[in-house]
């Protein structure tokens, strides 16, 4: 099984090392999740030709996957730490239903898919500790998420492959933007 950050053999061998700061821990956690996404994308791309052929095919989708915009304050121009942090946490909470959808979508990387999901939950907890304005964070409605999940799973095989590909691509982009923004905080 993939080893979560902070639990590798080097950590055990070096007990006198300085403990990670909150920011370092978050940074490491995101990079760990990004590694997991890379592995999942590799399986998706090997299994179907989604990665090359369909870049534009259904790019105009209505999945409404979380995405950074100028108004979110996460880009260098107009950077706003508090607004951005709220966007990152809200976005990750919205991604959770899509990460649930990814479970059972992988054969050889089943554990990796679970690791990405669980590590994202941990990342959300880290970030919530860092946020001052928790009231501004809206949590998705569980009933709506349950309906969404059912509908996603009812699609035909080709559309499910496409959905998997788009979720992984969007989640990777969202995490990369988050990582860049968090390094400015």
């Amino acid at each position: 099984a993939p080893v979560p950050p902070g639990e590798d053999s080097k950590d055990v061998a070096a007990p006198h090392r300085q403990p990670l700061t909150s920011s370092e821990r978050i940074d490491k956690q995101i990079r760990y999740i990004l590694d997991g996404i890379s592995a999942l994308r590799k399986e998706t791309c090997n299994k179907s030709n989604m990665c090359e052929s369909s870049k534009e095919a259904l790019a105009e989708n209505n999945l409404n996957l979380p995405k950074m915009a100028e108004k979110d304050g996460c880009f260098q121009s107009g950077f706003n730490e508090e607004t951005c942090l709220v966007k990152i946490i809200t976005g990750l909470l919205e991604f959770e239903v899509y990460l649930e959808y990814l479970q059972n979508r992988f054969e050889s990387s089943e554990e990796q898919a679970r690791a990405v999901q669980m590590s994202t939950k941990v990342l959300i907890q880290f970030l919530q500790k860092k946020a001052k304005n928790l009231d501004a964070i809206t949590t998705p409605d569980p009933t709506t998420n349950a309906s969404l999940l059912t509908k996603l799973q009812a699609q035909n095989q080709w559309l499910q492959d496409m959905t998997t590909h788009l979720i992984l691509r969007s989640f990777k982009e969202f995490l990369q933007s988050s990582l860049r923004a968090l390094r400015q905080m």
């Epitope: 409404n64 509908k151 699609q155």
Partner: nanobody
């Protein structure tokens, strides 16, 4: 139960314009809700024309109508419009309004749960 009623079809000459309306009643909107227009010419399959996401307002068109057709909405009236300009004989078809609460891909017909009866558009040369 959502009901869709189209209007605005008719006979028009090449280069002319028409505005189709689709009035929805009983709608429940999620952020994946979309309303679209499809068309079916005699002896052909029903094909996607244009669609609009209800919450975000983002729109999508099939290549053959880009720059000529515009899909828009009136939230207060629960109505979606299809403004069709520079009409061509190949636009002749029955135009159907469709809606779905969970439309993930605008062009995929079976993701729309509700359909109107259709309105005939005939473009004469």
């Amino acid at each position: 139960q959502v009901q869709l009623v189209e209007s605005g079809g008719g006979l028009v000459q090449t280069g002319g314009s028409l505005r189709l309306s689709c009035a929805a009643s009983g709608s429940t909107f999620s952020k994946h809700h979309a309303t679209g227009w499809f068309r079916q010419a005699p002896g052909k399959e029903r094909e996607f024309v244009a669609a609009l996401n209800w919450s975000g307002g983002n729109t999508y068109y099939t290549d053959s109508v880009k720059g000529r057709f515009t899909i828009s909405r009136d939230n207060a009236q629960n109505t979606v419009y299809l403004q069709m300009n520079s009409l061509k004989p190949e636009d002749t078809a029955v135009y159907y309004c469709a809606a779905g609460s969970y439309v993930f891909y605008f062009t995929v017909r079976d993701q729309y749960d509700y359909w109107g009866q259709g309105t005939q558009v005939t473009v004469s040369s």
